[in-house]
């Protein structure tokens, strides 16, 4: 398939409201940029089950963002 148009967010739609903590391998946060004007929370699942976008407005996402920011700053 061809490349996607530039300026596109990585996630489609609002994202899932929650992911089982036991299924999470890692969490990545993409902050607003020229390509996407919103924060995106991407969850990598264990056992090669791919990735899911977490709704950044969900309680779980807010906790993850807080945790990551605490770790980084």
């Amino acid at each position: 398939f061809p490349m996607f148009k530039r300026g596109r967010c990585l996630c489609i739609g609002p994202g899932v409201k929650a992911v089982k903590v036991a299924d999470i391998e890692k969490a990545s946060i993409m902050y607003p940029s020229n390509n996407c004007d919103k924060i995106e929370v991407i969850i990598t699942l264990k056992e090669n089950k791919g990735q899911r976008c977490l709704n950044p407005k969900s309680k779980q996402a807010r906790l993850i963002i807080k945790k990551v920011e605490r770790k980084n700053f």
Partner: nanobody, 126 residues
Framework: EVQLVESGGGLVQAGGSLRLSCAAS????????IGWFRQAPGKEREGVSW????????YYADSVKGRFTISSDNAKNTVYLQMNSLKPEDTAVYYC???????????????????WGQGTQVTVSS
């Protein structure tokens, strides 16, 4: 109970048109991306088009670009696939699927979709 029900398939001559519908129930429509896939006899299931219910973002496979149009009516929880200038190679069973939390990089990965319809047959004769 979650349900995706496709309709609108049939037999059409090459160059003709069909409109497929995918009626969804049992989940929050706005949270999901709805994809259309197709499977021809002896071939793997392939992605055709998808739409994000929340922001109406769309994407098409190269093979259908300019011929197929996907749209959604959120009030009816229904996604439509308007298929014009049909070719014999479009012959397949067409399925709709719903996935939440999808990434643009994995929209054609069938395992990422949570719910599937039963399919509707589209046959294009030459």
């Amino acid at each position: 109970e979650v349900q995706l029900v496709e309709s609108g398939g049939g037999l059409v001559q090459a160059g003709g048109s069909l409109r497929l519908s995918c009626a969804a129930s049992g989940f929050t429509f706005d949270d999901y991306a709805i994809g259309w896939f197709r499977q021809a006899p002896g071939k793997e299931r392939e992605g055709v088009s998808w739409i994000s219910s929340s922001d109406k973002d769309t994407y098409y496979a190269d093979s259908v670009k300019g011929r197929f149009t996907i749209s959604s009516d959120n009030a009816k929880n229904t996604v439509y696939l308007q298929m014009n200038s049909l070719k014999p190679e479009d012959t397949a069973v067409y399925y709709c699927a719903a996935g939440a939390g999808l990434l643009i990089a994995t929209i054609w990965t069938t395992q990422m979709y949570d719910y599937w319809g039963q399919g509707t047959q589209v046959t294009v004769s030459s």
